[in-house]
């Protein structure tokens, strides 16, 4: 495919990525699945900066981001170094509560009303961040 | 390969306190809870409470007030006090890592356990 | 807390027997079930997690059905060391409780 020069129609541009922000709200994976359908991912976040950036869009709004444990350590949902990245968690977060009664604890993050991280039952519809990068290959075939 | 190795006195005096620690090697104590779990002789398996490295901690309620947990990440290690011991206390002590998948938690990699005899 | 039972607390049986132990919840727990084997003097070993997922490493005539409140751990063929007793754990609830065990030993 050919390389995206600029971002999608109703995307916003920041730092050579594109961002889509939702307007409504869905289980983790079923946002995870979206942004994979738009050949994108769920949000990465790498820098202050970039946390101001989404956290200026999304507003105080719970809303999911590319960052998960399910299956043991965090991890980004494009690989990023979770060890050694940028975090932004809430004090004493994440804690894998088991208080909710829905079973199990809380295994995805998402962004609360003051933009820092928590983790939460991965269940819950959230509102969502998809993230794509500019100078990756998209996958439409190139114009001839 | 993850080990765990649980150290600390093997005798304790009723009304004292037990600490015992778990060292870590082969891998790293930022990435999972860690658990203490233990097993009076001859019976069934006791889950005492588990701790993240950001301080989060979780115990059994019925062990709650007598119970602290902390991590020092800097030995890759983690700890157990258990105050105001009994005789009822006498156990093979375990620390454990909790594993998940598909959000499912379990305990992957045990210690070896240590004996700990509350007695005078 | 979540109760854990096992039926039965004990059996026995020998080499090539099919064997099925069960375990059952105090309440729905979904598939947040564990089994774990401990062998004289040794920490329990994960067998099966998440009612049927088998642990990596252990043999496949170890299996696991159930979900909600009812569970099964199964050996296809029982084989010289799997003389030991067994133990399910529910990870629904905060407490991570076990079931009291269910010993299998040699008839």
């Known amino acids: 495919g050919s390389e995206r020069t600029c971002c999608p129609v109703n995307w916003v541009e920041h730092e050579r990525s594109c961002y889509w922000f939702s307007r409504s709200g869905k289980a983790w994976a079923d946002a995870d699945n979206y942004c994979r359908l738009e050949d994108a991912h769920l949000v990465v976040v790498t820098s202050w900066e970039e946390q101001k950036f989404v956290q200026h869009h999304i507003g105080p709004v719970n809303t999911w981001m590319g960052l998960h444990d399910q299956n043991g350590p965090w991890k980004w949902v494009d690989g990023t170094d979770y060890e050694t990245g940028f975090k932004n968690w809430r004090p004493e977060q994440p804690d894998d509560w088991y208080g909710h009664g829905l079973g199990g604890g809380e295994d995805c993050a998402h962004f609360t009303d003051d933009g820092r991280w928590n983790d939460d039952v991965c269940q819950r519809p959230y509102r969502w961040v998809c993230e794509t990068e500019l100078d990756k290959a998209s996958q439409e075939p190139p114009l001839l | 390969q993850v080990q765990l190795q649980e150290s600390g006195p093997g005798l304790v005096k009723p009304s004292e306190t037990l600490s015992l620690t778990c060292t870590v090697s082969?891998?790293?104590?930022?990435?999972?809870?860690w658990s203490w779990i233990r097993q009076p002789a001859g019976k069934g398996l006791e889950w005492i409470g588990r701790i993240y490295i950001r301080g989060s901690t979780n115990y059994n309620p019925s062990l709650k007030s007598r119970v602290t947990m902390s991590v020092d990440t800097s030995k890759n290690q983690f700890s157990l006090k258990l105050s105001s011991v009994t005789a009822a206390d006498t156990a093979v002590y375990y620390c454990?890592?909790?594993?998940?998948?598909?959000?499912?938690?379990?305990?992957?990699?045990w210690g070896q356990g240590t004996l700990v005899t509350v007695s005078s | 807390d979540i109760q854990m039972t096992q039926s039965p607390s004990s059996l026995s049986a020998s080499v090539g027997d099919r064997v099925t132990i069960t375990c059952r919840a105090s309440q729905s727990i979904s598939s947040y079930l564990n089994w774990y084997q401990q062998k004289p003097g040794k920490a329990p070993k994960l067998l099966i997690y998440a009612a049927s997922s088998l642990q990596s490493g252990v043999p496949s005539r170890f299996s696991g059905s159930g979900s909600g409140t009812d569970f099964t751990l199964t050996i296809s063929s029982l084989q010289p060391e799997d003389f030991a007793p067994y133990y399910c754990?529910?990870?629904?609830?905060?407490?991570?409780?076990f079931g009291p065990g269910t010993k299998v030993d040699i008839k």
């Open positions: 454990a890592r909790e594993g998940k998948t598909g959000g499912v938690s379990y305990f992957d990699y």
């Open positions: 754990q529910q990870s629904y609830n905060i407490s991570f409780t």
């Open positions: 082969g891998g790293s104590i930022s990435s999972h809870f």
